[in-house]
């Protein structure tokens, strides 16, 4: 799988888009997980609504939201109030039974707010020495939680 890099600004929202074949993944729920090391397991962060027909409703886990355009074939993840510790490798997944297919690997890059002049020297970044291959950069601002969208409480 190729990896796509999305760049966002610390303190702002980052919107990640994972396109997929809507027919091939018809009826499947989706998930967003964080890769623990380059070859480690992928830890689930948030998944789409339990009812596939309601996948368009935004679900939250903490500051991360997910919504799925099942007709257009685009999974969208929003990382709100992006922080340095959010940087790293993630996956967009398609779920079937207990299995998960990788739709796309995503590398999130966090950059300084150009209007914030505080020294970032003491901030902690995971895996500073690591580098990941296959990248694409995108930056966008997400919309806020709309009426009727379902917040997803943090999991323990």
């Amino acid at each position: 799988h190729n990896t796509t890099v999305f760049q966002g600004v610390a303190g702002q929202s980052l919107q990640v888009s994972c396109p997929y074949d809507s027919m091939k993944h018809w009826g499947r729920r989706k998930a967003w997980c964080r890769q623990l090391g380059e070859k480690g397991p992928c830890q689930r962060v948030v998944s789409t609504h339990n009812l596939w027909l309601l996948s368009f409703l935004r679900r939250w886990n903490g500051s991360t939201a997910i919504t799925d355009d099942t007709l257009g074939g685009t999974l969208t993840i929003t990382l709100r109030n992006l922080q340095p510790h959010d940087a790293g490798l993630y996956q967009c997944q398609s779920l079937h039974g207990s299995e998960a297919d990788t739709l796309r690997k995503v590398l999130v890059e966090v950059l300084a707010d150009p209007l914030d002049h505080r020294d970032a020297g003491d901030l902690w970044f995971p895996g500073e020495s690591e580098s990941f291959e296959d990248a694409h950069v995108e930056h966008s601002i997400s919309r806020s939680l709309l009426e009727g969208e379902i917040p997803f409480p943090p999991t323990s």
Partner: antibody, heavy 118, light 107 residues
């Protein structure tokens, strides 16, 4: 005004290493990825990789992973690229270029010419 | 790696001509495409990003179009200062790759 100022031309012997710099005044250095691009005489452009000056993380084209090391110094707003085990194939112009948020390398350095010759 | 193919490496044009340069990706790049202009001895200059967005300061005679795998750079009325090499670049997957370039020459 954004200006990327690259170090001067280099003439080095095969097998040696070289470290070139790209000074980036005029903007918030840690708010943009800094890329490096290779161009051999009369040929096209080749992406080497980028450095994130905020996190010090880097992302390399697999082809250059054993050839190039990208670093940066926030205090001087300078990005560096070290090339090792040089051969005549490494003779080229090397550009640094800033990634804009709208995709695309919006500001480029003037290029550093590297000549590898015995 | 995604291959970016510019079908013509060079072609002869006349001043005032409408010029169309094409770029084809080996897979869908979801409009993550930039166009650059480069003159001999100079660094490339970004003209268009996101396949269609004209950069600040770029003359309006330049435009970009396309989607999926196929993209086009158009110059409506070629001026002397437009004689250069034009390259496309994709951003969808790294290694970010460039087309081989298309050199415009005056007839």
């Amino acid at each position: 005004e954004v200006q990327l100022q690259q170090s001067g031309p280099e003439l080095v012997k095969p097998g040696a290493s070289v470290k070139m710099s790209c000074k980036a005044p005029g903007y918030s250095f840690t708010s943009y990825l800094m890329n490096w691009v290779k161009q051999k005489p009369g040929q096209g452009l080749e992406w080497i990789g980028y450095i994130n000056p905020y996190s010090a993380g880097s992302n390399y084209n697999e082809k250059f992973k054993d050839k190039a090391t990208l670093t940066s110094d926030k205090s001087s707003s300078t990005a560096y690229m070290e090339l090792r085990s040089l051969t005549s194939e490494d003779s080229a112009v090397y550009f640094c270029a800033r990634s804009s948020y709208r995709y695309g390398f919006d500001y480029w350095g003037q290029g550093t010419t590297l000549t590898v010759s015995s | 790696d995604i291959q970016m193919t510019q079908s013509s490496s060079s072609f002869s044009v006349s001043l005032g001509d409408r010029v169309t340069i094409t770029c084809k990706a080996s897979e869908d790049i979801y409009n993550r495409l930039a166009w650059y202009q480069q003159k001999p001895g100079n660094a490339p200059r970004l003209l268009i990003s996101g396949a269609t967005s004209l950069e600040t300061g770029v003359p309006s005679r330049f435009s970009g179009s396309g989607s999926g795998k196929d993209y086009t750079l158009s110059i409506t009325s070629l001026q002397t200062e437009d004689v250069a090499t034009y390259s496309c670049q994709q951003y969808w997957s790294t290694p970010w790759t460039f087309g081989g370039g298309t050199k415009l020459e005056i007839k």
